[in-house]
Structures are given as C-alpha cells and as structure tokens.
C-alpha cells in the first residue's frame, strides 16, 4: 500500500497547531511512530524530536481501506524562540519504512507576528499574534 | 528528572567581567530553549535572556543588551552567561531555566549562582 | 512593557481558609502563569496556561482569569502552602515579565 505523511498548521485563537497526518493501511499501523523535529536536518528521530506518537491497531475500524493518525503539537503562544526549520517524520519498527515530509518553517516578525511558510497543502500562513486571526 | 547546575559565580568589582555556566542532564537539552533569570537579594524574579534551541538566535533584557551575552554548547549538555561591564544593580542570584516548549513559562529550575558586584 | 502588579503583597491565613492572590496586567495578555518560591529555594513552576496545574501540584489550587485581571485560588490552605507566589506573563516585544510576588504566611 501507499504510505505517505503531510505536514499542516491551524490557529485557534492564540494556539497554533502543527499536525503531521500519516495515511496508512489499518493493519500498518501497528509499531508506527509519527513524530516531529524541529531544526533538525538530518538526524530527525523520535528521541530527538518535540513530540511523538505510537500508532496502535484500532479494532474498531473496519475494512482494510486507507486510514490517517494524527500527531498534533500545539503551541499557546508562539514567541521568537519557536522560529525554526521544522519537520514531520515517521517510521515503523516492524517494516523499516521511514517517512519524511517536507520541511516547514515558522517565522516570527519584528512585528510581533509569525508566518508559517512551506506547508504542502497551503503554501503560506500568516498568522497575526495579537488579532489570533489568518489573513 | 531534569537537573540544572549552575557554576561559576562569585564576587566581582564593578565594570568586570563573570561568566556562569549551566550543565543540563537528564533531558535532550539541543531539543530546548534555555534561559536565564535573576533575583537581587530579597527581590522579584526578572527574566535576563533566552537562547534557541538549534539556531542559536538569543534575546535579551533591555538592561543587559550589550553586556551580556547568552551562549550555548549543545554538544556539551550546556549553556553559558557571558557577563561584562558589571553594575551593583547585577547582583542577584541567577538561575538557569529551560523553556517549555508548548506554553511561555519556565518549567525546570536550577538551585542558582550568587553574583555580587561590589568594590 | 507589560506590567504586572500582584495583591495583597502580603497575606497571612489560616489552614483550612480560602487564599486568593489577584494579579493585574497593565495591558491585556493571553494566558498567566503561576510560581511557587520556598525560603532559600529557587522557584518552581506552579500553574501554567492560566489554569493548568504543574505536575504535582495538589488540586486545592486553581487558576483562573483573563485579560487583564488573574487570580491563584488555594480552596483549603496547607502550612505547606506558605511562600511567595509570583505570577508572569510573555508578550512581544518585552518577552517575559514577572509580578513582584505575594507572601503567603500561615497564620
């Protein structure tokens, strides 16, 4: 089957998420781990990472189509110090797959705002600080 | 747990210099920003400067800019606290924290390093 | 800058008495949070997020507030209860700044 990871950002308010979606077999998710990396070119790992999440098996589901699991890191506040290169990944210990989505970066502004630049799904996100809207 | 151990404090005349250093363990410490806040003797806490994770971009107090510098070794599980041109007014006590990544706050805390700037 | 001013600055209680140190902003910030400092003791992270209690912090405290006005809640003060509180705020571009501290005695 086709795996793949996508990386993507929503704001709520003040919050900013960062989301890495890995889509997936149901019976692949077993000894899946999704995790994210910031300022990290090449040894992205789950023991160096922010944030990570072990899939398991969910018997609920049925059929055999494609799913997608989710790793969400969510920021209050973003502040100069969240400025960075930042990426999702994800591997499974049973297969030996190893998944990299592209790199993304946040970018806080003398103005006191931050974009979040290189995302797949949507290209530019400016986010302003005070207004917590999207424009 | 996370440890934090400051060094390298002491008494020192004014318009010297001191540099404080701050062994972290216990955790991925390049995964972490890192900061350094004072408290003067029987006064409030007052943050000092900060320095990124993996950039290395750093920030400071207003008072401070100029003479002190924030420096990190990631190899070496430590940060550093250049300090020079002291004033009476940088006596206090300086605490290594680290930053938490999610929230504004400053989660683990070191014991500290007393700093007096007398002649 | 932000600034942030805490009342009472000083307040004995009781055990078992409900404790509430108020913290005022001087402009409108997003969230507060909350350290506890002991005699002789470097500070300890206590409520962060404005609610959200640190890990091990006994739910007899609470967090609460918005804009401008925040308040630390102790439902049944404890002698260990007694230290100062410092509340603290991040905003851009003054970064992070801290209240002056309220004394909490034990009566």
């Known amino acids: 089957g086709c795996i793949n990871i996508t990386s993507s950002a929503s704001q709520e308010g003040t919050r900013l998420n960062l989301i890495c979606t890995v889509w997936h077999k149901k019976e692949e998710a077993e000894g899946f781990v999704v995790f994210l990396c910031k300022d990290r070119s090449g040894d992205c790992s789950p023991e160096t990472s922010l944030k990570q999440l072990r899939l398991k098996r969910d018997p609920g589901i049925d059929g055999v189509g494609e799913i997608s699991s989710q790793l969400m890191f969510t920021i209050s506040q973003v502040t100069p110090l969240h400025s960075g290169t930042y990426q999702c990944c994800a591997r499974s210990q049973k297969s030996g797959i190893r998944l990299q989505g592209h790199f993304f970066s946040i970018l806080f502004t003398e103005t006191g705002n931050y974009t979040v630049t290189g995302l797949k799904q949507r290209q530019h996100l400016e986010f302003s600080h005070n207004e917590g809207t999207l424009s | 747990e996370v440890q934090l151990v400051e060094s390298g404090g002491g008494l020192v005349q004014p318009g010297r210099s001191l540099k404080l250093s701050c062994a972290a363990s216990r955790f991925t410490f390049s995964n972490y920003a890192m900061a350094w806040v004072r408290q003067a003797p029987t006064k409030g806490l007052e943050w000092v400067a900060s320095i990124s994770s993996g950039a290395g971009n750093t920030y400071y107090r207003d008072s401070v800019k100029g003479r002190f510098t924030i420096s990190r070794d990631n190899a070496k599980n430590t940060q550093y606290l250049q300090m020079g041109s002291l004033r009476s007014e940088d006596t206090a006590t300086y605490y290594c924290?680290?930053?938490?990544?999610?929230?504004?706050?400053?989660?683990?805390w070191g014991q500290g390093a007393s700093v007096t700037v007398s002649s | 800058e932000t600034v942030l001013t805490q009342s009472p600055t000083t307040t004995p209680a009781s055990p078992g008495e409900k404790v509430t140190i108020t913290c005022r902003a001087s402009?409108?910030?997003?969230?507060m949070h909350w350290y506890q400092q002991k005699s002789g003791a470097s500070p300890k992270l206590w409520i962060y997020?404005?609610?959200k209690l640190a890990s091990g912090v006994p739910n007899r405290f609470s967090g609460s507030g918005s804009g401008t006005s925040y308040s630390l809640t102790i439902n049944n003060m404890e002698a260990e209860d007694a230290a100062t509180y410092y509340c603290q705020q991040w905003n851009y571009p003054s970064m992070y700044t801290f209240g002056p501290g309220t004394k909490l005695e034990i009566k």
């Open positions: 997020d404005t609610s």
């Open positions: 924290v680290t930053h938490n990544y999610e929230s504004t706050v400053f989660d683990y």
């Open positions: 402009s409108s910030v997003s969230y």
